[in-house]
């Protein structure tokens, strides 16, 4: 189920998954959540003189068990991912950080007026991911009231520095609060030939747009659907970016479909899951475990209830069903995504709701627990 | 056998192939000798096929293609299935064949020890599964007979993977959990050996298993210890010491 | 000897419900799975619906989901097809049947080797 | 689902005669397949089950074979009891399907 609470100078042994920098705990914690294995994350606030540079480091862990041996370690802060909370679970970050430089690749620098301006405008440009400002005190003069807009491969800053004057925070594109507006087309038999960012496998376009949403770098998207040609490239979902942040004309291509990020939508973002149920399809993974249901739709509760589980497959074969009902396979892989699609299976395939806002879950207040 | 390699001649000396005479003639099942006048293989061969003239039953042969009309091949006299087996249950999946003429037995052709009942809680660990089966669901019968070594499993976890079906303590479980390594068609009634103090003994029958060599879906064989009063009693009523028995 | 009796078929109007009953006998009843198979006149088998041997999982066939529920009294050797919103599309001799599940060819194999003699149900107005 | 397809739909054929009906499923079935007989007014009889293995007490004129796609049954020698109707079964996934039959009359 839900777990908030919060574990205070307290670190989590072992797990590790991924490191990243992020600016509190919270930021952590929401990182955790969307990352398609991460359970745990333990996050350094405080750290000794002699590692710096591991202050705000942002530890993501998983565990088979769903927990880990927890250390006493002053100034760490760890805790639980919120993957099943239902409407806790948000992309969306409004805090700003003052006396913190979010470190990354600084793309463009502007002059406004203040911290709000600069927000707007990170959350107004194609590759902004977070942002710097420098107010009037700043020690540097040619800096002062200067908005730097930031990316990084990772979408989180590359790395955190206390600096006086310096105030930063996180693009708003995911609080649906972007004017660029969003390109709901979707282009059948064509493909665009920009640079990829990353590839996934997905069973249609409408996953692969979904995924592409939420990725931090993908602006737009090819997927090949089950008939193209090339068999390594069938059901794979090629997520994309252009300098410009706009795709190149895109080129006619049979079983090809193609189409654009939903992050600068305000009204029609889906939400970070896939809710629909594919007939005759499976989706091959690692197995999680198997457990015998009566009918697909309780075999995608029982992934979703079950915190590791990403997607599963329900078996009509005889041989499949038991006197509980079919076979319910919950799998798991790196991305979260199927490692392979295949066609023509007895029975059907799907994902967890576990990231859906509308999975009910009970209510839970975040615990501060000093340990 | 998936996920087996070729056996040598004179390797699996007990191993029979079953066939069948009808148009043609084709390997069916596999069998183990266990006495000159005795083999003994799975009920569920004779399904739809219970008559002893049409079986033809080949020993001391590695290659199927050995098999000319000339290769002699021992006929069935009596055919002995199980009283409680039902076609529709697949339990008790176990059967004597008694042949007509007794065998000679050679280097390539000889019996395989029977288990004694004390040896129902055996822990064995070298164990080989043989036969001309499938080497993968949707293949074909092998030319030369195959061998595979599979761990056996517990009854237990046995029947957590086979959830509809009763695991009974008279059958006993065989597979990797990864799958890869099993019987399959063709090698049904054919020997699981296992070597124990020194000798092979015949510890199972091979009967059923769910597809060949699946991940976390053993194969399920006749644990022949469970069956040795039934067997002593089938084959002594026709003659004394007509076994080779491990206490023998 | 195996038998199936089926009963409960007759003449009932569309929107109406009816039940049918599958008494068995001469195997244990409570060991095998059973099905409904039903053959609109002078048309081809078209299976109904399925259950455990002890009635914790069904399976039913699209054209009856919601309408139709299979059930069984294993201390009564009976089976049971209640049919509600009957159609005239759902005229036709229902048959109970016996699944089998063998062994063949190293396989566990399912097959309905023993029917009832069938029960006509007709929808009309 | 899976579609069973049955050729032909009617057969002529005289005492003695070889006959052969052919089922084809839309997508493999491995063996998971079954014939059975039906005469006007009674229930369907099994005779194959697992594409090739007789029923016990089927006459043993009656074979099976095939198995993926591609299935057939055979009568060896046509007997006046076996003028009926023949449907195949997938027994491989839910929802179990039949084919539409084989009707075989006397020529």
């Known amino acids: 189920g839900c777990m908030t609470q919060l574990y205070k100078n307290t670190f989590f042994r072992g797990g590790d998954l991924a490191a990243i920098y992020t600016p509190d705990a919270q930021y952590c914690q929401k990182m955790c959540t969307f990352h398609p294995r991460c359970l745990l994350f333990s996050f350094l606030a405080v750290t000794p003189p002699k590692e710096t540079n591991k202050r705000f480091g942002c530890f993501m862990k998983e565990s088979i068990t769903g927990t880990l041996p927890r250390i006493h370690r002053t100034g760490a802060i760890s805790g639980h991912s919120l993957k099943q909370c239902g409407h806790q679970i948000s992309a969306c970050h409004r805090d700003i950080y003052k006396g913190l430089d979010m470190r990354g690749s600084n793309f463009n620098i502007s002059k406004t007026d203040n911290i709000e301006e600069c927000q707007k405008l990170c959350t107004n440009n194609f590759h902004c991911q977070f942002f710097t400002y420098a107010t009037s005190a700043f020690y540097r003069p040619e800096y002062r009231k200067k908005c730097l807009l930031k990316h990084s491969a990772s979408g989180t800053p590359t790395s955190i520095k206390s600096a006086d004057n310096l105030v930063s925070g996180f693009s708003l594109k995911s609080c649906a609060l972007s004017e660029i507006g969003c390109p709901m087309d979707i282009f059948q038999h064509s493909a665009f030939a920009d640079l990829n960012v990353s590839q996934v496998i997905t069973p249609d376009a409408f996953v692969c747009r979904t995924i592409c949403t939420f990725h931090p770098n993908c602006l737009f998207f090819t997927f090949y659907t089950n008939e193209w040609e090339t068999e390594s490239q069938r059901n794979v979902c090629f997520l994309k970016t252009s300098k410009s942040g706009r795709p190149s004309p895109p080129i006619p291509q049979e079983n090809a479909i193609s189409g654009y990020s939903l992050l600068t939508c305000r009204k029609t973002r889906p939400e970070p899951c896939h809710s629909k149920i594919y007939s005759g399809v499976d989706f091959e993974g690692e197995e999680l475990n198997v457990t015998f249901v009566q009918g697909a739709d309780v075999c995608q509760e029982t992934c979703t209830k079950t915190i590791r589980c990403q997607f599963f497959i329900y078996s009509l074969l005889p041989q499949d069903c038991k006197e509980e009902g079919c076979k319910c396979s919950l799998r798991l892989s790196t991305d979260g995504s199927p490692t392979r699609i295949t066609y023509g299976m007895q029975g059907s395939s799907g994902y967890s709701l576990r990231l859906c806002k509308l999975v009910d879950s009970p209510d839970c207040t975040t615990k501060i627990n000093a340990r | 056998i998936v996920g087996g390699t070729n056996a040598s001649l004179g390797e699996w000396p007990w191993q029979v192939s079953l066939q069948v005479k009808l148009v043609s003639q084709t390997h069916l099942c596999g069998g183990s000798i266990i006495g000159r006048q005795w083999v003994l293989t799975a009920a569920h061969c004779f399904d739809g096929i219970p008559y002893p003239d049409v079986w033809r039953i080949y020993g001391g042969i590695l290659s199927l293609s050995e098999i000319t009309k000339e290769t002699p091949s021992s006929r069935i006299k009596e055919l002995i299935i199980h009283q409680e087996y039902k076609v529709s249950e697949g339990n008790y999946d176990i059967a004597l064949i008694k042949l007509q003429t007794p065998l000679n037995y050679t280097e390539f052709q000889k019996p395989i020890c029977l288990p004694s009942k004390a040896d129902t809680n055996t822990i064995y660990t070298n164990c080989w599964v043989t036969g001309w089966g499938y080497t993968k669901e949707q293949g074909e019968t092998q030319n030369i007979l195959q061998k595979a070594t599979i761990p056996l499993v517990p009854n237990e976890e046995c029947q957590k993977k086979y959830r509809d079906y009763v695991i009974n303590k008279q059958m006993i479980c065989a597979g990797y959990k990864e799958g890869g390594t099993d019987a399959c068609k063709g090698d049904s009634g054919g020997p699981l050996v296992c070597k124990h103090s020194g000798r092979w003994q015949l510890v199972g029958i091979t009967s059923w298993g769910e597809g060949c060599g699946r991940k976390d879906q053993p194969g399920v064989y006749t644990k022949v210890s469970e069956y040795m009063d039934w067997i002593l009693e089938k084959t002594q009523s026709s003659d004394v010491r007509a076994l080779e028995t491990s206490s023998a | 000897e195996v038998q199936l009796l089926e009963s409960g078929g007759g003449l009932v109007q569309p929107g109406g419900s009816l039940r049918l009953s599958c008494a068995a006998s001469?195997?244990?009843?409570?060991?095998?799975?059973m099905t409904w198979v039903r053959q609109a006149p002078g048309k081809g088998l078209e299976w109904v619906s399925y259950i455990s041997p002890s009635g914790g999982h069904t399976i039913y066939a699209d054209s009856v989901k919601g309408r139709f529920t299979i059930s069984r009294d294993n201390s009564k050797n009976t089976l049971y097809l209640q049919m509600n919103s009957l159609r005239a599309e759902d005229t036709a001799v229902y048959y109970c049947?016996?699944?089998?599940?063998?062994?063949?060819?190293?396989?566990?194999?399912?097959?309905?080797?023993?029917w009832g003699q069938g029960t006509l149900v007709t929808v009309s107005s | 689902d899976i579609q069973m397809t049955q050729s032909p739909s009617f057969l002529s054929a005289s005492v003695g005669d070889r006959v052969t009906i052919t089922c084809r499923a839309s997508?493999?079935?491995?063996?998971?397949l079954a014939w059975y007989q039906q005469k006007p007014g009674k229930a369907p009889k099994l005779l194959i089950y697992a594409a090739s293995t007789l029923q016990s007490g089927v006459p043993s004129r009656f074979s099976g074979s095939g198995s993926g796609t591609e299935f057939t049954l055979t009568i060896s020698s046509l007997q006046p009891e076996d003028f009926a109707t023949y449907y195949c079964?997938?027994?491989?996934?839910?929802?179990?399907?039949f084919g539409g039959g084989t009707k075989v009359e006397i020529k």
């Open positions: 001469g195997f244990t009843f409570s060991h095998y799975l």
């Open positions: 049947a016996r699944v089998a599940r063998g062994i063949a060819a190293r396989s566990r194999t399912s097959y309905f080797d023993y």
């Open positions: 997508q493999g079935i491995s063996s998971y």
């Open positions: 079964q997938q027994l491989n996934s839910y929802p179990l399907t």
